[in-house]
């Protein structure tokens, strides 16, 4: 166990031309704060990936108001160190992200607004217990100067904080097999404290809290003998014993993740996915609340109603993530069809369509009718990503190949009889009715309920309407 410590020395304009404008003004006074995110190893990871080694926020710095006409000086900084506790071994190599945030203190509705001024990242090798390392990083026109170190928390010592030291029990020397603790020569290296309950006969550990089994033993505490019955294991019989070797305990056995974290195995070890409010390699670091200002990009922090959610960040438009740390990429919604390329322009989504497709979402197939003949004099109609045939009279179906029965829909009203005809259909009307579909009653006095006749036609002349 130990603590990573970060000391910010200055944040201000870098050397060279193009000095940045001051982030604060008389109208909009502001103050700075910093966030550090640590990850084990030297992997080039996205800013949004979890801070598996831990994260910390600084206090807010003094309020700063720009002096009119003056160039941006080094800005006033928060007091104190940023401290990131780690419970397990210090990895020796690590990646860091340090963010400089501005808190505007104008008359915003809904409290102060936060915005990211600068983000620097790096990958370093660092032994725990060593001196402060100094660093300078540039982000655009800004320059950040800082120092950092990793120190072990007693009783841990060593470059990885895995060796434990105890005061000497005898004044002259340490116990059998235990060396003096350098640089604390008056203390002795203590035996490693394995996982509680780890079998002293069949288990051992190379790091605190671990329990690794000798051959022939298994289980999270190495108390279960490997089966000596006939060997069902695909590995076959063990050469060392008469039984079978079953795989030893997996890295997630016994769930090393604290505080309700869920464990997943990785090629080298394990990874904990921590519930909100906890972080660290094993979700052991807790206590993030709204007072720590965990919501970025102007997110509004609301205290959670239960331990599962010590806080909830309500993100402004355009941001997401449990801390509003991710810019929403609306292309993640997969809005473009037919292989179109999505572009999130901020104010709008655009789909760049492949050849042969069109529409705001590339949903229209321009080649709907290409090579799609409609039979029997039908014409092809494009649209909706599928071609459609508008069929000539007397034909139907998808490609107008089916002969349609024009009488199937019973088009003749009032008991009229329908006859299929090469040009369509003919209705033979029942007595008292007339019209192409027998839709008009003929009144007994010879007048009919026909609409006003077109010029040159007498009302009640049924022949003229057939």
């Amino acid at each position: 166990a130990g603590v990573f410590e970060l000391q910010i020395h200055s944040f201000g304009p870098g050397p060279g031309p193009g000095a940045p404008r001051s982030p604060c003004s008389a109208r909009l006074p502001c103050r700075l704060f910093f966030r550090v995110c640590l990850k084990p190893g030297l992997s080039e990871e996205a800013a949004e990936s979890p801070c598996a080694l831990g994260a910390a926020l600084s206090a807010r710095g003094p309020v700063y108001t720009e002096q009119p006409g003056a160039p941006a000086p080094d800005l006033p900084l928060p007091d104190g160190l940023l401290q990131v506790p780690f419970r397990d071994a210090w990895p020796g190599t690590f990646s860091f992200i340090i963010e400089t945030w501005r808190e505007e203190l104008g008359d915003q509705i809904g409290g102060p607004a936060w915005s990211l001024l600068a983000r620097v990242a790096g990958r370093r090798r660092l032994a725990a217990g060593g001196p402060w390392a100094r660093d300078i990083q540039r982000a655009g026109a800004w320059e950040l100067r800082f120092s950092y170190r990793a120190r072990c928390e007693p009783p841990a010592v060593g470059t990885a904080c895995t060796r434990l030291c105890r005061p000497r029990s005898a004044p002259s020397r340490c116990g059998p097999g235990l060396r003096p603790c350098a640089p604390l020569e008056d203390e002795c290296e203590a035996p490693l404290v394995c996982r509680a309950g780890c079998s002293p006969e069949h288990g051992f550990c190379e790091q605190p809290g671990e329990c690794r089994c000798l051959e022939g033993w298994t289980g999270p505490l190495c108390t279960v003998p490997v089966s000596t019955s006939s060997c069902l294991s695909p590995r076959g019989p063990s050469s060392a014993t008469t039984g079978c070797l079953v795989p030893g305990p997996g890295p997630c056995d016994g769930n090393p993740c604290a505080n309700g974290g869920s464990c997943s195995e990785t090629p080298r070890s394990f990874e904990c996915t921590c519930p909100r409010g906890f972080y660290g390699l094993r979700c052991e670091v807790s206590g993030v609340t709204c007072a720590d200002g965990p919501c970025f990009n102007g997110g509004l922090c609301v205290g959670g109603a239960d331990p599962d959610s010590a806080y909830i960040c309500h993100c402004p438009p355009g941001f997401q993530g449990s801390n509003c740390e991710k810019r929403v990429d609306r292309c993640s919604l997969q809005p473009c069809r037919n292989g179109g390329l999505c572009l999130d322009l901020g104010h709008a989504l655009r789909c760049r369509c492949r050849a042969g497709f069109a529409g705001p979402r590339c949903e229209h197939d321009l080649d709907d009718c290409a090579g799609r003949a409609c039979a029997n004099g039908g014409t092809c109609v494009e649209g909706g990503g599928a071609h459609r045939c508008s069929c000539a009279l007397g034909f139907g179906g998808r490609d107008c190949r089916e002969r349609a029965d024009p009488c199937a829909a019973r088009p003749c009203a009032h008991g009229g009889r329908c006859y299929a005809h090469f040009s369509g259909l003919v209705c033979a009307c029942a007595p008292g009715y007339m019209g192409a579909r027998c839709e008009f009653p003929v009144h007994p006095d010879g007048a009919s309920a026909l609409p006003a006749a077109p010029p040159g036609l007498r009302p009640g002349d049924p022949q003229r309407y057939l």
Partner: antibody, heavy 117, light 107 residues
Framework: QIQLVQSGPELKKPGETVKISCKAS????????MHWVKQAPGKGLKWMGW????????GYADDFKGRFAFSLETSASTAYLQINNLKNEDTATYFC??????????WGQGTSVTVSS | DIQMTQTTSSLSASLGDRVTISCRAS??????LNWYQQKPDGTVKLLIY???RLHSGVPSRFSGSGSGTDYSLTISNLELEDIATYFC?????????FGGGTKLEIK
């Protein structure tokens, strides 16, 4: 034809975990994002968020951050919704729905989750 | 978040009637307005997308119109199978939001 088939109803106790599945068929699963919608008894529809079926990246509406997790089994064309540490107010019907660029064009039949001690 | 308001929570009409259901957004949603139908058995179907486009397989008696903040769904000739609850939804800005629903009943 396009279908989204969800797993059956669930009866759970507070504090337990539930995992609902949504199996897609009739289209290329990784071409369309999958969305989840909650409907409490007698109430309207509430959008929970989505998962990008190509990358597996989820996005959550504010009210569904923390205890809710969207995931995929791409080889089985299946999306999942997991709710941890269930509470009485999680009692609802949960729908999965495909997004076509304009709207959620096809919906699952819904999975009823009842949380009761 | 954009609020979607369906002022009429329930509506009675006769078969064959022309029925209009309205929906109002708290800000301009640039025609990214969709209408869904939820049948009494709980199944949900898309009817209209992008204000006025008819989803495939939806009868032509359904139509949509509107712009800016005010939108409406019209059923030109009410049929028995149209008995359902209708929801509007905006797809302009995340998070997507739904109206409270309008339950359509037969007189």
């Amino acid at each position: 034809q396009i279908q989204l088939v969800q797993s059956g109803p669930e009866l759970k106790k507070p504090g337990e975990t539930v995992k609902i599945s949504c199996k897609a068929s009739g289209y290329t699963f990784t071409d369309y994002s999958m969305h989840w919608v909650k409907q409490a008894p007698g109430k309207g529809l509430k959008w929970m968020g989505w998962i990008n079926t190509e990358t597996g990246e989820p996005g959550y509406a504010d009210d569904f951050k923390g205890r809710f997790a969207f995931s995929l089994e791409t080889s089985a064309s299946t999306a999942y919704l997991q709710i941890n540490n269930l509470k009485n107010e999680d009692t609802a019907t949960y729908f999965c729905a495909r997004y076509d660029g304009y709207a959620m064009d096809y919906w699952g039949q819904g999975t009823s989750v009842t949380v009761s001690s | 978040d954009i609020q979607m308001t369906q002022t009429t929570s329930s509506l009675s009409a006769s078969l064959g009637d022309r029925v209009t259901i309205s929906c109002r957004a708290s800000q301009d949603i640039s025609n990214y307005l969709n209408w869904y139908q939820q049948k009494p058995d709980g199944t949900v179907k898309l009817l209209i997308y992008h204000t006025s486009r008819l989803h495939s397989g939806v009868p032509s008696r359904f139509s949509g119109s509107g712009s800016g903040t005010d939108y409406s769904l019209t059923i030109s000739n009410l049929e028995l199978e149209d008995i359902a609850t209708y929801f509007c939804q905006q797809g302009d800005m995340l998070p997507w939001t739904f109206g409270g629903g309008t339950k359509l009943e037969i007189k």
